[in-house]
């Protein structure tokens, strides 16, 4: 009686259960009543990451430097290449097929979260008492200078883009 289902890591062909090829290898010929499945290792720059009956290995992903990409981890015969973005850039999608420049936070906004290889800069408006006078992908909002602790008084109020200006206290004549 020919089998209708096969064990794990096997496949059914010609009413027979044949062994699948292990990761990193491709199928050359199915097993027969007298021979085992014939498999061959994937070539350089190729991979297969599952037990399979594929007759062709997959090409490793190319991390194109012209798209801001670099190789984070080289592929093996069992794994694909992992691409990431060069410093200062982040992936445009989960597949990381291209990169865009990290956004900078404008004056009046500070960095809430620095960008990573996969996420953009997160900016936040500087609250009262804080300021940012630069466009930056790294700078947080800075607190206004405390004139009192320097024995000075506020001569010009601060804004979300400028620090307070301190000056000497008026002397009584």
């Amino acid at each position: 009686e020919p089998p209708t289902a096969c064990r794990e890591k096997q496949y059914l062909i010609n009413s027979q259960c044949c062994s699948l090829c292990q990761p990193g290898q491709k199928l050359v010929s199915d097993c027969t009543e007298f021979t085992e499945t014939e498999c061959l290792p994937c070539g350089e720059s190729e991979f297969l990451d599952t037990w399979n009956r594929e007759t062709h290995c997959h090409q490793h992903k190319y991390c194109d430097p012209n798209l801001g990409l670099r190789v984070q981890q080289k592929g093996t015969s069992e794994t694909d290449t992992i691409c990431t973005c060069e410093e200062g850039w982040h992936c445009t999608s989960e597949a990381c097929e291209s990169c865009v420049l990290h956004r900078s936070c404008s004056p009046g906004f500070g960095v809430k979260q620095i960008a990573t290889g996969v996420s953009d800069t997160i900016c936040e408006p500087c609250p009262v008492g804080f300021f940012s006078n630069v466009s930056s992908a790294f700078e947080k909002c800075h607190p206004w200078t405390s004139c009192e602790t320097k024995d000075l008084v506020v001569q010009q109020a601060g804004t979300n883009k400028t620090d307070v200006v301190c000056g000497p206290q008026d002397r009584l004549r």
């Epitope: 350089e44 720059s45 190319y62 430097p65 670099r70 190789v71 984070q72 981890q73 080289k74 794994t79 992992i82 990431t84 060069e86 990573t116 290889g117």
Partner: antibody, heavy 114, light 110 residues
């Protein structure tokens, strides 16, 4: 971003020695890290590399069994399992794959002598 | 893999041009994982070129890398006295166990 090697010193042959590369501002989960050495008056020699995600290690044929590379989140170690006088060299820690953009540390000197 | 560099030393006149070749016994990763380094006595290597032809940050454009696959060249034009150093090529391969450096080429500036 910077790298600094430490642990280089005078050791006697056969005494295991671990060199440490301490990184600053570098996410080791995003970069392969390698070790290269240079004997006095000689050329550069690739020792091995540890990959970013999986932490797999690859060694030059001549270095297999003689060195072990491992890492934490902020350091990359190179263990010289049984140093011989031929291992006297300056050891450099390198960020990135060979052939791609690299960042090198200043190096640490290991002297093996009885 | 084996990287064979132009034998040392190579002589160059100030203002002249010098070329150093680097031949690999097998194809480098992506056809372009080949770097060039400059090293002066007592200093760590300084990266000049990566991806075979990309100039590293801060390196003068007098340095030019070319080639692909197994054959690569570093050309220094308008040679300066400060260019006197040893130059190494370094190849990265599909299997990182094959990664290697060339033997180095000393450039003497007259």
């Amino acid at each position: 971003q910077s790298l600094e090697e430490s642990g280089g010193r005078l050791v006697t042959p056969g005494t295991p020695l671990t060199l440490t590369c301490t990184v600053s501002g570098i996410d080791l989960s995003r970069y392969a890290m390698g070790w290269v050495r240079q004997a006095p008056g000689k050329g550069l020699e690739f020792i091995g590399i540890i990959t970013s995600n999986s932490g797999d290690t690859y060694y030059a044929t001549w270095a297999k069994g003689r060195f072990t590379i491992s890492k934490t989140s902020t350091t990359v170690d190179l263990k010289i399992t049984s140093p011989t006088t031929e291992d006297t060299a300056t050891y450099f820690c390198v960020r990135g794959y060979i052939g791609a953009p690299n960042l090198w540390g200043p190096g640490t000197l290991v002297t093996v002598s009885s | 893999a084996v990287l064979t560099q132009t034998p040392s030393p190579v002589s160059a006149a100030v203002g002249g041009t010098v070329s150093i070749s680097c031949q690999s016994s097998k194809t480098v990763y992506y056809n372009n994982y080949l770097s060039w380094f400059q090293q002066k006595p007592g200093q760590p290597p300084k990266e000049l070129i990566y991806y075979a032809s990309t100039l590293s940050s801060g390196v003068p454009s007098r340095f030019k890398g070319s080639g692909s696959g197994t054959q690569f060249t570093l050309t220094i034009s308008d040679v300066q006295c400060d260019d006197a150093a040893t130059y190494y090529c370094a190849g990265g391969y599909n299997s990182d166990s094959d990664n290697t450096f060339g033997g180095g080429t000393e450039v003497v500036v007259k």
